[in-house]
Every structure is written in C-alpha cells, then in structure tokens.
C-alpha cells in the first residue's frame, strides 16, 4: 500500500532533486503543528509568529492581542501562562533542562490590568515548577526542592514544606525514576478542580544508590554528576501524598493519603492522582512486581479534616500474563456522577479495551470491544465519549478519533476522522476545549501534517489552522521516497512492517537494506505519519531501502503480542527482526551482501543482539546509547518487563541477555558503538561495557563517544552524528562518497 | 467539646528536663497539626513548637532547636514536649494549641515551667 | 522572622465605645495567614479572627477584622464589659509563627 504517491512526472524528473543530509539536519522539512492553549469553551490562546499572545473567540470570529511580544521580550520569554481569571500571566525565560521533562527557569508575573509586572514579592530563581490554581490567581510553585504558595501573586509565599533537600527529599517533583519511568511530567502536585486544595507527592531518595559521572565541561578538573537512580534490584525511592487546603494551609498543614494496605505491605509505586471532585481524590498506586495496581478514592471528611480512602472504593487492575498495563497503568476518566469512571484496560480476549465501572472492577461494562485497541480517552461529556483506536481498516499504526454517545441507549459508535482526509490523514490526536464545545484535529501523516478546529456538536470543520503550505511547496521538486505499510504472517504472528523505498524503485533490482529498530516494550515503530528524516534521506540520495519492523512486545495489537516478551527482554525481539530480513530477502529486492541493522537505545540493545546472533544475515550495524545489561537500567522500566535480578525471581535471564555475553559473535560484523557520556537514562557505563567485553575477547570494532551529551545527542553532536552514522553505512555498503 | 489539658509543669534546675503532655479530646487528634505556644510572666506569646499530621514533620523556633523534641502519640490521643538543657529564660506558662502555623484555634489551659536554681 | 508591632499598647474605653487596634509586620503578610486573640488574665488565649477577617466560631459580630500587606486592623463595633482584655494578633505565613506583643483594653 503506497501511502505517499510520488509526485514525478517524467517531464518534471530533471527539476527533482534528492533528500540530501543537510537538508535532514538544518531541518528544511519540519513541520508545524497548531494544539490550541484553551481557556474556556470557546476561547483559547495562541503565540502568533510575530510572537505575540493572542486570544480567540471562537464564536464571534474575534481576536485580540493579550499580550504583545515587546513585554515578552522585555524578559526574554519563551513561555506563558494565564491565569484563569485573567488578571495575570506569568513569563517563563532562562529555561535550563534538567532531565527529560524537567526543567527550571526564571518566572515573572505580568499585572494585564495595569500593564505592569509585579513588584514587591518577586518569585525566588530558579524555579523548578509553577502553576496557578484552576480558579482565580493562586500561584503554586516548586523552589529548591519545596513547594510554596502564594494566595495572589503579589502576596508573600506561604512555605508547605520545608524538608526538601538536594537529591534527597523532593516535594511537588518528581526525582528521576519517577519523572522518567512513572509520571512523565516535570511536577508532582495536582490543583483540586477549584482550587481548594492542593496534592502533592513527596519523595524520599535518602537509600537510593547514586549514579556518578564525569561532566567534562571547561574547567580544569571535571565536575561530578550525582543522580539518584534505582537501577534493577537496588532500593527504591519511597513515595508519600500529601493534601493541604490552599484556604487557611497554615491551620491543619498537610494531610497524607492513606496507602490501601494491599499495596502498602511491600515495596509499592504512586503511579497517579486524578482529581475527582474538590473533596474527592483518586490515587492510583502499583506493587513494585508491576502486575497488581490498585485505585483508590478517597473523600474528604469535613468533620475530622481528613481524607478518607475505604476499602470499597478500592478497585483492583491485575495481569496474570503480563505487568499491569500497557506502558503506564492507565489513569481514569470520570463521568458526571462523580463516582464512576471510564478506563482502558486489557478485556477476556486480552485487547486493551474502554470498560465503564460503576461499583467494582468484575462489574465494568465494556464499551469498546475487538481485534485492536483503544489507545487513549481525551474527553468524557454528559452525552459523548471520545476516544481514539486503531480499529478502522485494521491497521494498527493508524490512530482515529472516535465518539460514543453514552447520552443514548443503546450507545452509538462515529468515526469522527476516518473519511476526513482519507489519504492525507490516518495518524490523529485531538485537544478539546472546556465541555467538548469546540476541538483541534492534528493529523500526523501519513501526508504533510494538517490542523483543524472542529464543532464539538456537529463535528464539522471550521477552519484550518495549519496546513503546512510552505512545507507542500518545499517538497514539490524533492524526489521523496515511497512508503509502503504492509504486515507478514509468520507463525501465527503478525509482523506489520514500514518499508521505506528509494524514489525510482525498481524491484527487480537488488538494493541495500537498512533496518532501523525500536522495538521497546509496548512501542510502535510502524505508523501512518508522515517524517523527512535521515532515513528518507539514505533512500532518496542513496538508494537504500530502510524497513521498520513491528515485532513481539510491541503496542496496540493485543496481549499475546505485548506481553510475548514478559522476562524475557532480548530474544523475541531480536527473533522478529531477523525473521522479517528473511522474508524482505525472499522478496527479491534486497541484496542479501548489505544488510545492515541500527538503532538507539532500546533500539541499541536489539540492533547490538542482532548482529550478535550468528546469523550471517549481517555486514554491519550501529548501536546509539544501547543498554547493555538490565542489571544497569532503571529499576521501574526494567522490573515491569523483567521481574527482579535475584536468584529466586529473574538473574539467570538477566545474565543471559546481556550484549556483553555475546562479544565472540561480533567478529565476523562490523560494529559502530556510540554513547554520550553524560547520558544520565542510559548510562555510559552500558557502552564501557559493551567496548571492554569486545577488547577483552580480541574483537575489533569502531566506536563514538559524544563529550557531555546525554541520550538525546543534541545539538552540533546530531549532525556530527548523522554524518558518521552515514559515512559508516556507505562504506559497508560500498557507495561512493 | 474540644478539650486540651497540659501537664508535666514544675520547678526544674537549669541544664535539667521536663516533659510536657497534652491530652487532647473532643476531635480527631490525629488529623490535625498541634502545637506549643508559651508565655512568659507578664510578657507575650512566643511559639515554641509545632508537629504535622504525619510524624516526622515537626518543627521548632530557633530558641529551642536542639534542646525540645516535639512528638505525638495517635492512638492516646497526647501530644508531648521534651525539654532538655533547660535555661532560665525558659521559665513560662506552656500551652498546648490546636493549629499548625496559625489560627489556633483550641489552647488547653496551661502549664508551669519555672527553671530557677 | 516577622516581627508584629501592635499599637497602642494600651486602649483606655469606655463600655459601648469603637475599639480600633492596629498590628503592623515588619515585611508583607497574606491575610489567610493573620490572626487575632483575646486573653483574659488566668486564662489560655482564645481565636477571635482568622483570615484576618473571619470571625472564629462563636465570635459576636461586633468584633471584626481588615487589613492586608503589613497594615491590620481589629475592630470592636460597641465594647461589652467582657471585651476589656488583652489582644494579640498573630501571622502563620512563616515558620516561626509569630504574635505581636498585645494591646490591652482597659475600662477608662
């Protein structure tokens, strides 16, 4: 199935030109998305190109600037926030990464009544998180590891802890297995829906070993990097929730929610907190053996100031064949009642599916059901439910927005989006204004991404909001490659794959072949999205075809495929893999003397056991910030997939599926090994390893380090890195330069 | 009816101890942050003390940091002060009160605590 | 710490008169966190106002309470006989806590 009809007409070929990799890496083919900031039902904001904040209306066709770019760069911002009762917006500038999410930055607070900021009761610098309340112009912030809050942003903080303390104690953020492996945010606290009161998580890393590393830098002598990092086995961070009422917090203090003693008996997560109600909280909460979790809702009990979480509101989500789960537990979606909620979780036949709970888990009514899955609820109304699926036309790369009308009985199912744009459009995610009034459509491809603002009744289309014309004009005299999603059926398993073809394919001619690898617990590598990346680039300008392969532990395709690979990280992912080149030989386009295999992080460990097989299927392959060994991972990621690495649970296959275990079959490939040093996610120490066990059994093989990079390899390192990575493949597939 | 009522006063040498106790009914004592607040003869009010909900959030003024533990025992409905190292500026009328960081809204009665040699 | 100035130390009234104490901090105070208390001699102080401007259970609507920054105001409508006592005012914005050092209404 050819999604990208190429455009070359023999009259126009000699205008074409190819991808060339400095198109990849000055980024001439991005594209732009538009996600509406929205502020009511029918209002939201947007940051024009000019760098102005502008506020539209939706229903009068009205906009006005709320805020112009001279006092966005009087401070230097590159962010803001309004808040709800739109008498102030806070600036963000001297943004500073962290980690993934995380991140700290200069917050200032703009008075739009008066056309000033505010003076007196500055915030403090850094901040590591801000946010305002969901109603008026409280402010909660995180400073140094404790969280303050101020009643109105001109007022004094109000101090709620005070035991936070650099790489030990964390209140309102998360430290760094929680931030990367738990929550995947930034913040660890949660507004009530009106304000009253404010959750936050506090965790205690005092028992956590620390990852050190050296951060060369400029000066002398190298800093070091101490990060707390449970790695598989190693003691974990210890979670408490706090609740303090944001009215008087100076009276009661903070609260701690009870943990359902289930849970609370062992090692256990805080995985997430939803507000209910004001006075209604749900927590949800996983054993640290990832396949039991348990939510919780808990009620605010006036007359003793407490909270209060009865056994009968605990609901029990466990797996018997795999963790609980697709990558997170899924978080609930709450109807009106304010009791019952709508979830996505694994039905009878093991297809991740929405489920109704009204009283208890064996009680849920199932409202979704068949061979594919729901993927994520983004809003419950009184009469609508919205989803989106990967059920129409079966492709399991495919993600459609859907609506259930829960209003009627018996419940109908609309396909909001399949007949959209059919061609262009297959890959969607949605963001709704406040009661489904109104919502932004975002199509990822497989065409040039398109947004749109849409009807929240009627479902009709009200304007574009960005179509992505330069980007169309751009690519009018670029000779693309060809795309094709297409599956193979081997031994009851289905393998779907993308192959990425050169612009003039011809099949009966024999190519080099690419295969770039994920393959990650729960990941998908094969979708409908449209990408000009350093791939297209190898097909277009040098003839290589690429395949992505989708095999066992990957998402969206049922249990059976998801949890194949339950303690048993390493074999069947790298089983697929070299399945599916069997078969792309079979097909008789591929010479079978260039093969080659890379990927990046997960992708590195499975292109690295690959080449490692003893196949012979493989010249060469590369490997980007592989793990190595579990034994060195995150204890969260690591143990949901693999259980614990001791003699009575899991060491003997963590052992076995090390890279380092297989260093003798490296010989006969040749291996390009690549890490950044400051990678605080996939330490260097998994590349260290890989290189000793390599020179230890005399094997040759060619290696990068990236100086004070970390996993992304951002910045002049990707160009760097590209460049090697390409002048690697050419030369094992003997292209000219 | 909210009740506190104090005990544990007395005459004591300086560098000596006292501990403080404080029964608490007529509410959840267990949901709500308590608190030490003295009073020296003739003079104001100075807080000494205050202990969270959950145990281990306890903090202190600078005068006695070091010196006075603050605790709480839930399931006996008292909250307790230790005081070690005892000076003569101590000497003051303890009360116990119900509130964290203020309003206090509940104070028991008071107890004495002279430190004179 | 904050330091809470109250003034005047001592207010000499008669029954039925307008009370007006003042309590000034010495940095700014969120009025969620101001205070105020009446003591009686003998006796433990007792919560008149929080917010500074809600009255505490119980409390006769003759007292009240205003103010916000570093300038508060508790106010006595119409002093009653048992109104003659000590007043202190009190901030819970930060650890410590602190009380200014009471203005005493006297009978004149």
């Known amino acids: 199935i050819v999604l990208r009809p190429s455009r070359v007409h023999n009259s126009e070929e000699n205008t074409m030109r190819a991808l060339t990799l400095k198109d990849i890496l000055n980024g001439t083919f991005s594209y732009k998305t538009f996600f509406p900031n929205w502020i009511s039902g029918q209002e939201y904001l947007h940051q024009s190109a000019d760098n102005n904040i502008v506020l539209y209306n939706i229903e009068t066709g009205q906009s006005y600037t709320i805020l112009s770019n001279r006092t966005m760069k009087s401070v230097n911002a590159s962010n803001y926030g309004l808040s709800p009762d739109r008498q102030f917006v806070y600036l963000e500038s001297d943004y500073s990464k962290l980690w993934r999410y995380s991140y700290t930055a200069t917050y200032y607070i703009y008075d739009l009544s008066n056309g000033e900021f505010v003076r007196g009761n500055e915030l403090p610098r850094p901040i590591q998180y801000l946010c305002w309340s969901p109603v008026g112009s409280k402010l909660a912030y995180v400073y140094q590891n404790n969280i303050y809050l101020k009643q109105r942003p001109g007022d004094p903080p109000f101090q709620i802890t005070f035991n936070g303390r650099e790489n030990k104690i964390f209140n309102g953020i998360p430290d760094w297995v929680y931030e990367e492996e738990m929550l995947a945010t930034k913040y660890a606290l949660w507004w009530s829906p009106n304000g009253k009161f404010l959750a936050y998580a506090e965790f205690n890393d005092t028992d956590i070993p620390v990852i050190a590393y050296s951060y060369y830098g400029d000066e002398q002598y190298p800093r070091t990097i101490n990060i707390p990092y449970p790695k598989a086995g190693a003691k974990n961070p210890v979670v408490r929730i706090f609740i303090i009422d944001t009215t008087y917090p100076a009276y009661v203090g903070p609260q701690e929610v009870p943990v359902p003693a289930m849970i609370a008996s062992s090692d256990y997560y805080f995985s997430w907190l939803t507000w209910v109600t004001d006075e209604r909280v749900c927590l949800q909460w996983l054993k640290r053996v990832q396949n039991v979790s348990v939510l919780s809702i808990c009620d605010f009990r006036e007359d003793w100031q407490t909270w209060d979480c009865p056994k009968t509101q605990e609901h029990i989500e466990e797996s018997r064949t795999g963790w609980a789960g697709g990558f997170f537990v899924s978080t609930p979606v709450f109807s009106y009642d304010a009791i019952s909620y709508y979830k996505i979780f694994s039905d009878k036949d093991g297809y991740k599916h929405i489920h109704y709970i009204k009283d208890t888990v064996e009680n849920a009514i199932q409202i979704t059901s068949g061979k594919w899955e729901a993927i994520n609820i983004f809003r419950v109304t009184q009469d609508s439910l919205f989803y989106s699926s990967n059920e129409f036309e079966e492709y399991p790369g495919r993600r459609n927005i859907y609506r259930i009308s829960i209003g009627s009985y018996p419940p109908s199912k609309k396909c909001v989006t399949c007949h959209l744009r059919k061609e262009r459009c297959q890959y969607y995610t949605a963001s709704f204004s406040d009661y489904a009034k109104y919502y932004a459509l975002v199509c990822y491809g497989p065409g040039i991404p398109i947004s749109t603002l849409h009807d929240g009744r009627t479902d009709q289309e009200i304007k574009i909001l960005e179509e992505n014309k330069e980007l169309e004009n751009a690519l009018k005299n670029i000779q693309l490659p060809k795309e094709e999603i297409k599956k193979l059926e081997v031994d009851e398993i289905t393998l779907w794959y993308k192959m990425i073809l050169p612009p003039q394919f011809d099949r009966s001619k024999k190519y080099p072949l690419l295969i770039q690898v994920y393959g990650g617990p729960c990941s998908q590598s094969v979708r409908s999205v449209f990408a000009v990346n350093w791939i297209s680039y190898l097909a277009s300008k040098e003839g290589m075809v690429i395949a992505l392969v989708d095999g066992r532990g990957t998402a969206f395709q049922g249990d059976k495929l998801l949890y194949a690979v339950y303690r048993k990280l390493g074999v069947y992912e790298v089983e697929d893999q070299i399945t599916a080149v069997r078969k792309f030989i079979e097909m008789g386009f591929i010479d079978e003397k260039r093969i080659a295999i890379w990927g990046w992080s997960y992708g590195g460990y499975v292109s690295s056991l690959a080449l490692a097989s003893g196949t012979g299927l493989f010249k060469c392959g590369i490997a980007v910030a592989p793990v190595s060994s579990w034994e060195y991972y995150a204890s969260v990621y690591t143990e949901r997939f693999m259980g614990l690495p001791t003699k009575d649970d899991n060491l003997e296959h963590y052992k076995n599926s090390t890279v380092m275990a297989r260093a003798e079959y490296f010989r006969n490939v040749d291996y390009l090994l690549i890490h950044g040093t400051a990678d605080d996610n996939v330490h260097f120490q998994n590349s260290a390893q890989i290189a000793k066990a390599l020179v230890n059994a005399q094997v040759d093989f060619q290696a990068m380090w990236y100086s004070d990079q970390n996993h992304g390899l951002s910045g002049l390192s990707t160009n760097h890195l590209y460049t090697h990575m390409t002048h690697f493949l050419k030369q094992c597939f003997s292209l000219s330069d | 009816e909210v009740q506190l009522l104090e005990s544990g006063g007395g005459l004591v040498q300086p560098g000596g101890s006292l501990r403080l106790s404080c029964a608490a009914s007529?509410?959840?004592?267990?949901?709500?942050?308590m608190s030490w607040v003295r009073q020296t003869p003739g003079k104001g009010l100075e807080w000494v003390s205050a202990?969270?909900?959950?145990?281990?959030?306890?903090y202190y003024a600078d005068s006695v940091k070091g010196r006075f533990t603050i605790s709480r025992d839930n399931s006996k409905n008292t909250l307790y002060l230790q005081m070690n190292s005892l000076r003569a500026e101590d000497t003051a009328v303890y009360y116990c009160?119900?509130?964290?960081?203020?309003?206090?809204?509940?104070w028991g009665q008071g107890t004495l605590v002279t430190v004179s040699s | 710490e904050i330091v809470l100035t109250q003034s005047p130390g001592t207010l000499s009234l008669s029954p039925g008169e307008r009370a007006t104490l003042s309590c000034r901090a010495s940095?700014?105070?969120?009025?969620?966190?101001l205070a105020w208390y009446q003591q009686k001699p003998g006796q433990a102080p007792r919560l008149l106002i929080y917010?500074?401007?809600s009255r505490a259970t119980g409390i006769p609507d003759r007292f009240s309470g205003s103010g916000s920054g570093t300038d508060f105001t508790l106010t006595i409508s119409r002093l009653e006989p048992e109104d003659f006592a000590v007043y202190y005012c009190?901030?819970?914005?930060?650890?410590?806590?602190?009380f200014g050092q009471g203005t005493k209404v006297e009978i004149k």
């Open positions: 009160a119900k509130g964290w960081l203020g309003p206090f809204d509940y």
């Open positions: 202990i969270g909900v959950s145990t281990g959030s306890t």
């Open positions: 917010g500074a401007s």
């Open positions: 940095q700014s105070v969120s009025s969620s966190y």
């Open positions: 009190q901030q819970g914005q930060l650890i410590p806590p602190t």
């Open positions: 007529g509410f959840t004592f267990s949901s709500y942050a």
